[in-house]
């Protein structure tokens, strides 16, 4: 029987007795800034090169023994989950070992930094096909480590690393809080959380997903035919590299925006138990569990879409929060959240080139967050079109009035303090999807894009009754680009994608009298591209 | 993920550019910082990555590195360059007391300067 | 699925010996600290000895030292129970059982989280008696 | 060596009941203590380990809790499968001992 992480992560199709999905990652270099290894453990001779880089702290207290055994504990278990021949996920991926970390597992910023810097040189002299690199370690929030990272991955290669495994925000950890890397968290057979002694994965929005990381089953360094169950955020990130691998191997061209979104879209859904996280980091954690593509091809016609939680904006009255894209990827929409409900609202606006979403915190607030939907548009000419607070009593409306130009998301933004509260809902006139309406006293911005084959529409979800979430959801084929609440629901907190589905939150209802203002409308924006599709048919 | 609107703990020393015959004035009047991990038992003291702007040249490095050492002897500071950056990130890792911070925070072309810490294997 | 299969019980004599032999199947095996654990008629459960997964380390309960040994054949699946000197105390059933148990971990140390014995065999008698 | 105390050594239940069983270390063992279920004939079944944690296909009415010497076994409402004989277990570097059994009975 396979181990049950393999399971987990082994789409239906692939399964059988043997884990043996198609080409196990042949085309790629995996790279593991780790512990020393044992080259010669029967799960991994042949496929990983010890490299000569080896910068490593002295090993603390006078009463330590440096076992051999124990000095390749960690690095040898990992290995062997990326690229072990019974264990492994990805069984024709080659590795390079670099020792960063000691015999009991510590090393230091300035180790790791020259570790990546070793793997940049090496790549310009030897270029070869796509590179992973693996991080399972984390120090504290490190500037100078992110931006090694950000160079690296920048330079073409996709890093992966731990969200480390001390129960808390993974942005307070390096290399887990660079935005280049992808970060991992770790959950066990049950897709709970993995609890670590008293502590256990981190958390947060700084994660990117989440993979199998307790109980698993990988080379032990005691002797080359051991096995030994070892269980952290650094065997989750593992996983990831070796699916990393895969997807490389099977498409050699694919970014490092591409592979994220990717990752993201065949993880599994809203199975994680949520409650094990602290209430305050449930929403901004994802609830996903990654997984291998069920077939290796035949992705590219898709929409693809992620959402992307700034930093908390703090709570002074003019603070603000920005959430960003990365360099390849289009903002579609941008939306904001307050657990107070005190907010004034969110805009998109160029910074340095690029849109990036400001969400703005109102008086008396505790903070907002700002929410950009980040996506996968080839060849897109996006544009935002503002309209400013109308004189009259209709509301302010605004839409895409360049030719071709489709509504991918709307923002709304006031200067107000308090929206009025008393106004009635603004409703949308039918047969008008490609505008965005607001409150008069609010400025709208409508995210207006032209890329080959796109096309749009709006799908609404009302409750007369006061609800705290109003979900709308895009159909199969389509891709949640935009989300936002209808005007005059006055006590909503913020609206934010989960996934395909767009969440309006509201105050707890016990607080809102069940009056007209009650009612609450999610609306979604969904999209799909006719024009990926085709080339993906071409192509095959 | 973490961006420069970042919510993490650091501490910044922000220091001006005071006149120091041996120091140049970092350019525009940009301040140079100085970042530590917030995590006190992970802090490694005594050894520093100083990062230099972005566009600086290797030479450019090597010039800098050797310019902090001999303004560290003259005040009678030993300090070691443990390695000089290049192809990620421009700069240089030193072995020096904290008391020379201020004064390698002026040196030219200085990005930033980060306290060594602690990883740990997950 | 994991299963374990003990054998080698039977009677003897005090004074004699047996072994005890359980066979596994899976790699996870060789992945897991494993156990012996006796059930003595109509007694409670007592835990016997245990190895290491590389059988580098191996921990026995007092009244046994010096008897028993524990062993495990990782390219065989195997693990055994040599019993020497047996006593009509050690009457019992004999169960196998995998120690569930995985390392992570912390700041510069390397921890073992024990989940407890979660797979056993069906049991294997052991009567000692003239 | 470290001693498990368990009381009671029987209880008498019905079928609907909440019983708690307990467990008494003769010196601290933090958090490492498992509890399994055994039926006439058949090998023991893991149910909790690390004093509180439901070990995986183990119905959510048993659960356990307690640390450093005191420990419970609680069945919310005692199902006709539960009547079968409780032990717990503690871990101590690598070395275990087990408490000596309840009987949990049908009243």
């Known amino acids: 029987s396979i181990p049950w992480n393999l399971e987990r992560i082994t789409p239906p199709r692939y399964r059988a007795d043997e884990y043996q999905p198609p080409d196990g990652g042949s085309l790629v270099e995996v790279y593991l800034l780790d512990t020393s290894i044992q080259s010669d453990h029967r799960e991994i001779e042949g496929r990983v090169m010890v490299t000569d880089f080896e910068n490593v702290p002295e090993e603390d207290g006078t009463r330590f023994h440096r076992q051999a055994s124990k000095c390749d504990s960690h690095g040898t278990h990992l290995a062997g989950v990326v690229s072990g021949r019974d264990a492994g996920v990805a069984k024709g991926a080659s590795m390079r070992s670099l020792r960063v970390l000691n015999c009991q597992g510590k090393g230091t910023v300035s180790g790791t930094l020259i570790g990546l810097e070793f793997i940049r040189k090496s790549q310009l002299v030897q270029p070869v096909g796509p590179l992973v690199v693996l991080l399972p370690l984390a120090g504290g929030y490190s500037r100078v480590l992110n931006a090694a990272c950000q160079r690296l991955a920048r330079a073409g290669v996709v890093l992966v690393t731990a969200a480390g495994n001390f129960r808390d925000d993974a942005c307070l950890y390096s290399p887990a809080s660079a935005p280049e890397v992808i970060t991992v968290g770790a959950t066990n057979a049950q897709d709970q959380p993995v609890t670590l002694g008293t502590l256990g994965t981190n958390f947060g929005r700084c994660v990117d997903l989440f993979a199998p990381g307790e109980d698993i089953i990988g080379a032990s360094s005691d002797c080359s035919t051991c096995f030994v169950s070892q269980s952290g955020t650094s065997q989750a990130a593992a996983h990831v590299a070796g699916i990393a691998a895969m997807m490389l191997s099977a498409e050699p061209e694919l970014t490092l925006a591409e592979l994220r979104q990717r990752l993201i879209h065949f993880s599994a859904k809203d199975v994680i138990n949520e409650a094990w996280f602290p209430e305050d980091q449930r929403v901004l954690t994802p609830n996903l569990v990654a997984a291998l593509p069920p077939s290796t091809h035949g992705a590219g016609w898709q929409l693809f879409c992620r959402t992307v939680w700034s930093a908390h904006s703090g709570p002074t009255r003019m603070a603000t929060a920005v959430a960003r894209c990365a360099p390849d990827e289009e903002l579609l929409s941008c939306s904001s959240f307050s657990r107070s409900g005190k907010r004034r609202g969110e805009r998109m606006e160029a910074q340095g080139g690029k849109l990036v979403c400001r969400a703005h915190n109102a008086f008396g607030g505790e903070g907002v967050y700002a929410i950009a939907r980040c996506c996968l548009l080839p060849q897109a000419n996006c544009s935002v079109h503002t309209a400013p607070p109308a004189e009259a009593s209709m509301g302010t409306r605004v839409h895409c009035h360049q030719q071709g130009h489709v509504l991918t998301g709307c923002s709304s933004h006031w200067e107000v303090e308090d929206l009025g509260t008393h106004k009635p809902p603004v409703l949308r006139p039918r047969g008008q999807p490609n505008q965005c309406v607001g409150h008069r006293e609010a400025s709208i911005h409508a995210s207006c894009c032209h890329a080959p084959g796109l096309e749009c529409k709006v799908k609404e979800h009302g409750i007369p009754a006061p609800q705290e979430q109003v979900t709308v959801a895009c159909e199969e084929g389509w891709t949640l680009t935009g989300c936002s609440a209808l005007p005059g629901t006055s006590h909503v907190l913020g609206a934010y994608a989960v996934d395909n589905t767009c969440v309006v939150r509201s105050r707890d209802v016990s607080t809102t009298g069940s009056t007209s203002e009650g009612a609450v409308t999610a609306v979604a924006i969904c999209c799909r591209s006719r024009h990926l599709a085709q080339a993906s048919q071409e192509l095959q | 993920q973490e961006d420069e609107d970042g919510d993490y703990e650091e501490l910044v020393l922000a220091l001006r550019s005071e006149e120091d015959g041996l120091a140049e004035a970092p350019e525009h009047g940009t301040t140079a910082t100085f970042h530590r991990c917030a995590k006190d038992p992970w802090r490694l003291p005594g050894t520093y990555v100083v990062v230099l702007k972005e566009e600086t040249h290797l030479s450019q490095s090597e010039r800098t590195a050797r310019r902090l050492q001999a303004q560290a002897a003259r005040r009678g500071y030993l300090t070691k360059i443990l390695h000089v950056f290049h192809g990620l990130l421009p700069g240089f890792l030193v072995k020096m007391s904290g008391d020379l911070l201020e004064l390698a925070l002026k040196l030219p072309h200085v990005d930033y300067i980060e306290e060594d810490s602690s990883v740990f294997a997950q | 699925e994991v299963q374990l299969v003990e054998s080698g019980g039977g009677l003897v004599q005090p004074g004699g010996s047996l072994r005890l032999s359980c066979a596994a199947s899976?790699?996870?095996?060789?992945?897991?600290?494993m156990s012996w654990v006796r059930q003595a008629p109509g007694k409670g459960l007592e835990w016997v000895a245990n190895i290491k997964q590389d059988g580098s380390e191996k921990y026995y309960v007092d009244s046994v030292k010096g008897r028993f040994t524990i062993s495990r054949d990782i390219a065989k699946n195997s693990l055994y129970l040599q019993m020497n000197s047996l006593r009509a105390e050690d009457t019992a059933v004999y169960y196998c059982a995998r120690d569930r148990g995985t390392y992570y971990y912390t700041e510069g140390s390397y921890n073992y989280y024990y989940y407890g014995m979660d797979v056993w065999g069906q049991g294997t008698t052991v009567t000692v008696s003239s | 060596d470290i001693q498990m105390t368990q009381s009671p050594s029987t209880l008498s239940a019905s079928v609907g009941d909440r019983v708690t069983i307990t467990c008494r270390a003769s010196?601290?063992?933090?958090?490492?203590l498992a509890w399994y279920q055994q039926k006439p004939g058949k090998a023991p079944k893991l149910l909790i380990y690390k004093a509180s944690s439901l070990e995986s296909g183990v119905p959510s009415r048993f659960s356990g809790s307690g640390s450093g010497t005191e420990f419970t076994l609680t069945i919310s409402s005692l199902q006709p499968d539960d009547f079968a004989t409780y032990y717990c277990?503690?871990?101590?570097?690598?070395?275990?001992?087990f408490g000596q059994g309840t009987k949990l009975e049908i009243k």
């Open positions: 899976g790699i996870t095996f060789s992945s897991y600290w």
């Open positions: 010196q601290s063992i933090s958090s490492w």
């Open positions: 277990q503690q871990y101590n570097s690598y070395s275990y001992t």
